[in-house]
Interface confidence: low
């Protein structure tokens, strides 16, 4: 091989010990736990005339593996057993007959950390490329799902919330989505990397958390995002009043039935006569309640559950103060990772006992 052809390989640090056999691959690759990576790889080997028509088999081995004894982590040889731990996750994606040794890793696991070397076999021509080796580093999963809310949430009106993990790869095991919500919900359609939750918020869902949890079962790792439903009182119907509750500041909204009717959606005609007066009462009581409740984490969960798969309960964060009948409610900074969603309430009639019970909806 001319020296000029070898220079770029030397520069890349990719020259194997035998100049007739060389391999070019990045020496280090980092992948987050549960995710995937495709490592481009090219190799070269001399082809004696007697091996010209032999099939080319490629193998990736973990460093220290003994060829005669240990199975590879990936190969294109169909009858070759591979390591149980990497089966289906490590693939020799490149075509060795075209000098391509590219390796695909999906559902990366912590124990995939380590170095790997490539071996080729073509008839009697066999060679293990011990240098360079590919070093795989598996790091913490830092990506988190996105929750998309189209427009404003209004009580009694169903909206589709989408939880997506667009950063996940297509080739990996499809993730398992779990939703945790106090509001009445049902599951909508899902794609490989997104799940839709149909939410029908009620007035008492103000200040409650909605969490989308995504589990990458192939690696046994979970990530989640929580948003907070932030209630604002925007009366649009002059005949609709707001019942203020007892002003105790207790956050004990019962949300027993997830697929049930929206509690307190109807209001009596009598309240309409006292609309302005009630607005002032609401203002006063909500201020008082907010001062008492913000920062508390009390829960009084009820046993009546209503989600198809009600498994998990979560503590309720305190509601935020509402300063006027029509103004937007300021949000309380509970967690820098907490995101807020707005609910516009045309009318409300919360129960005095307001302990919120959360339901989990799981989609697979």
């Amino acid at each position: 091989m001319p020296l000029l052809l070898l220079l770029p390989l030397l520069w890349a640090g990719a020259l194997a010990m035998d100049p007739n056999f060389w391999l070019q691959v990045q020496e280090s690759v980092t992948v987050q736990e549960g995710l995937c990576v495709l490592v481009p790889c090219t190799f070269f080997h001399p082809i004696p005339y007697y091996d010209k028509n032999s099939p080319v088999h490629g193998y990736w081995f973990r460093e220290g593996a003994i060829i005669s004894r240990d199975s590879p982590v990936a190969t294109n040889k169909l009858d070759q057993e591979v390591q149980e731990e990497t089966q289906g996750r490590f693939r020799l994606l490149g075509d060795p007959s075209r000098n391509n040794c590219s390796l695909s890793i999906v559902d990366a696991r912590r124990r995939d950390n380590g170095s790997y070397f490539f071996r080729m076999e073509r008839g009697s021509t066999k060679y293990s490329y011990k240098s360079p080796q590919l070093s795989v580093h598996v790091t913490d999963l830092t990506h988190r799902p996105k929750i998309l809310i189209p427009g404003t949430l209004e009580p009694g009106h169903s909206k589709n919330l989408t939880c997506s993990v667009s950063w996940a790869c297509e080739q990996g095991t499809p993730p398992i989505f779990s939703w945790l919500s106090a509001a009445p919900t049902s599951l909508g359609p899902r794609t490989t990397h997104s799940s839709v939750l149909i939410i029908t918020p009620r007035p008492q869902d103000h200040g409650t958390n909605l969490t989308c949890q995504v589990k990458f079962a192939g690696a046994g790792v979970t990530t989640e995002r929580t948003i907070q439903l932030n209630v604002t009182y925007v009366p649009q119907n002059p005949t609709t009043g707001i019942f203020p509750g007892d002003g105790s500041g207790k956050q004990e909204t019962r949300a027993g039935v997830v697929h049930g009717a929206i509690g307190g959606a109807g209001v009596t005609a009598l309240l309409a006569l006292c609309l302005c007066l009630i607005f002032f009462i609401v203002k006063t009581h909500r201020r008082k309640a907010a001062r008492t409740a913000v920062g508390r984490n009390d829960t009084h969960p009820t046993t009546g559950s209503a989600s198809p798969k009600h498994q998990k309960k979560s503590k309720l964060h305190g509601p935020t103060e509402t300063s006027s009948c029509s103004g937007a409610a300021p949000t309380v900074e509970m967690d820098e990772e907490l995101h807020y969603a707005s609910l516009n309430f045309h009318g409300m009639n919360p129960s005095k006992d307001t302990s919120t019970e959360y339901s989990e909806v799981r989609t697979q």
């Epitope: 973990r62 460093e63 220290g64 593996a65 003994i66 005669s68 004894r69 149980e84 124990r111 380590g114």
Partner: antibody, heavy 120, light 107 residues
Framework: EVQLLESGGGLVQPGGSLRLSCAAS????????MSWVRQAPGKGLEWVSA????????YYADSVKGRFTISRDNSKNTLYLQMNSLRAEDTAVYYC?????????????WGQGTLVTVSS | EIVLTQSPATLSLSPGERATLSCRAS??????LAWYQQKPGQAPRLLIY???NRATGIPARFSGSGSGTDFTLTISSLEPEDFAVYYC?????????FGGGTKVEIK
């Protein structure tokens, strides 16, 4: 500093059972294969069993297959050897040894050994 | 299984002398052979791996050579602490096997 400390040896009657432990420190335990190697009094070394770093693969010498079980608890950095149906010929010092690489190869670190005596 | 035969069984030499220990495999083990040193009452200690590579902290007077079926451990000039039993081990095939050992004793 890599350290391997065996325990659990002792005197046991033929047909009896014993469980050896090997506490490891000074290296990332889960990344390396581990083995048990024994040495009968005044004799040479005999490899007994090996286990891969994750515990997913195990290997045994024919002389102990079906009687001994190797296992590991990576959360405790501990290697185990459960020995059942013990015979007089199992009498030996049992060493816990760390493989240099992920799968069983040569051994770069050894424990000090624990003596197992099988006698009636 | 691969049988490793070490010779001689005992080697009587004086400090400063050269020691040559042999290990022969019943079939080729390529270069997948290691050498260990064991002193009475102690655990074995790795000297050489992959037939010719010295392990960390092993003095340069120890060297290994050979491939296939014939291997040699050479101690260029014996020090008093080198008198011990030496074992070879192959890791090319399961089961892993050791040679019977060569005892290097003071003459």
């Amino acid at each position: 500093e890599v350290q391997l400390l065996e325990s659990g040896g002792g005197l046991v009657q033929p047909g009896g059972s014993l469980r050896l432990s090997c506490a490891a420190s000074g290296f990332t335990f889960s990344s390396y294969a581990m083995s048990w190697v024994r040495q009968a009094p005044g004799k040479g070394l005999e490899w007994v069993s090996a286990i891969s770093g994750s515990g997913g693969s195990t290997y045994y010498a024919d002389s102990v297959k079906g009687r001994f079980t190797i296992s590991r608890d990576n959360s405790k950095n501990t290697l185990y050897l459960q020995m059942n149906s013990l015979r007089a010929e199992d009498t030996a010092v049992y060493y816990c040894a760390k493989s240099r690489y992920y799968y069983g190869d040569y051994f770069d670190y050894w424990g000090q050994g624990t003596l197992v005596t099988v006698s009636s | 299984e691969i049988v490793l035969t070490q010779s001689p069984a005992t080697l009587s030499l004086s400090p400063g002398e050269r020691a040559t220990l042999s290990c022969r495999a019943s079939q080729s083990v390529s270069s997948y052979l290691a050498w260990y040193q064991q002193k009475p009452g102690q655990a074995p200690r790795l000297l050489i791996y992959d037939a010719s590579n010295r392990a960390t902290g092993i003095p340069a007077r120890f060297s290994g050579s050979g491939s296939g079926t014939d291997f040699t451990l050479t101690i260029s000039s014996l020090e008093p602490e080198d008198f011990a039993v030496y074992y070879c081990q192959q890791y090319y095939f399961w089961p892993l096997t050791f040679g019977g050992g060569t005892k290097v004793e003071i003459k």
